[in-house]
Interface confidence: medium
């Protein structure tokens, strides 16, 4: 039975040209995390594999940095980066857990962090 929950940074906002850290945390399970995928809609941004390390998709190499931890740093943000981001935890033996983050990239300096929320 899958007992774990994913805690994410929830709904967040950031300024155009700035950077933002996407973070997820898997808790309430002893399952082994074997890979974390970071995806934007249907596009793969990056993966962190337990044995093979990080891989950043070639199309995002200039603007995506691995970490901190299993998180992902997006740089040189544009308004087009607004949207849903997903952390997909592949675990053994539980299977797959998915967390959702919504990022809004703002033109002005009114960006503020939203509240955290959980996805079971």
């Amino acid at each position: 039975m899958m007992t774990g929950t994913i805690e994410t940074t929830g709904n967040i906002s950031a300024e155009k040209g700035g950077s933002i850290i996407l973070q997820c945390h898997l808790s309430s399970t002893t399952a082994q995390v074997t890979q974390v995928n970071w995806e934007q809609q249907d596009q793969l941004l990056a993966i962190c594999n337990a044995d093979l390390g990080w891989h950043i998709s070639p199309s995002f190499k200039d603007r995506v940095a691995p970490g901190p931890g299993l998180g992902l740093t997006l740089q040189s943000l544009t308004v087009n980066d607004t949207g849903e981001y997903f952390c997909i935890y592949h675990t053994y033996p539980d299977g797959t857990y998915t967390g959702r983050i919504f990022l809004e990239v703002l033109e002005s300096s009114v960006a503020e962090h939203g509240a955290r929320f959980q996805i079971p």
């Epitope: 082994q32 074997t34 890979q35 995928n37 793969l44 993966i47 594999n49 337990a50 044995d51 093979l52 891989h55 998709s57 070639p58 592949h90 053994y92």
Partner: antibody, heavy 126, light 112 residues
Framework: QVTLKESGPVLVKPTETLTLTCTFS??????????VGWIRQPPGKALEWLAN???????YYNPSLKNRLTISKDTSKSQAVLTMTNMDPVDTATYYC??????????????????WGQGTTVTVSS | DIVMTQSPLSLPVTPGEPASISCRSS???????????LSWYLQKPGQSPQLLIY???NLASGVPDRFSGSGSGTDFTLKISRVEAEDVGVYYC?????????FGQGTKLEIK
């Protein structure tokens, strides 16, 4: 450090079944995208891919040998096992196992058969 | 099956001179994800094969930069800018676009 080592009989009689074990360290077959492949090389000849087994228990076989091959894994022992039935003298070869990351699962090739075992030589003769 | 054809099959080279090996596939190795699944391996005498180059032109970890790979689609080339004695062995190209993964016949590089 990733290492793999093949073990099995040195001599097999025709029609018998060959069982080879690949014992590995430095990676896990619980890890998403990873697998172990088996490759063989008859004396003085080219390499021939035989089979792969993946972290999710998916199996791929060379169609030319599919009805003779079975691949399995014991994740807790960090082992992959290849069995080959109805052995023939033409199956005399050095058999290798190697680590592999599944193509198209985002990996660009740097982990495709990137570390090999030392190989084990199997002779089929009566 | 995808057939991999290498040439030449034998390549005598003087140390310090360049060397070139050709590999042709019977089908394009370009995947829809933009990656070309072509690797080169070197099997030194009495040893297991070792990964030299992946995805046409990327050097595997620890491989000297005198090795280089080029090509696209169905035609690929492995080059050694200056051959050294330690480069002797059999070179194989391999496709892993689809099962069964297939190797070329091998090119034996020897020192003149």
């Amino acid at each position: 450090q990733v290492t793999l080592k093949e073990s099995g009989p040195v001599l097999v009689k025709p029609t018998e079944t060959l069982t080879l074990t690949c014992t590995f360290s430095g990676f896990s077959l619980r890890t998403y995208g990873l697998g172990v492949g088996w490759i063989r090389q008859p004396p003085g000849k080219a390499l021939e891919w035989l089979a792969n087994i993946w972290w999710d228990d998916d199996e791929y076989y060379n169609p030319s040998l599919k009805n003779r091959l079975t691949i399995s894994k014991d994740t807790s022992k960090s082992q992959a096992v290849l069995t080959m039935t109805n052995m023939d003298p033409v199956d005399t070869a050095t058999y290798y196992c190697a680590r592999i990351a599944r193509p198209h699962y985002y990996w660009d090739g740097r982990y495709i058969l990137d570390v090999w075992g030392q190989g084990t030589t199997v002779t089929v003769s009566s | 099956d995808i057939v991999m054809t290498q040439s030449p099959l034998s390549l005598p080279v003087t140390p310090g001179e360049p060397a070139s090996i050709s590999c042709r596939s019977s089908k394009s190795l370009l995947h829809s994800n933009g990656i070309t699944y072509l690797s080169w391996y070197l099997q030194k005498p009495g040893q297991s094969p070792q990964l030299l180059i992946y995805q046409i032109s990327n050097l595997a970890s620890g491989v000297p930069d005198r090795f280089s790979g080029s090509g696209s689609g169905t035609d690929f080339t492995l080059k050694i800018s200056r051959v050294e004695a330690e480069d002797v062995g059999v070179y194989y190209c391999m496709q892993f676009l689809e099962v069964p993964y297939t190797f070329g016949q091998g090119t034996k590089l020897e020192i003149k």
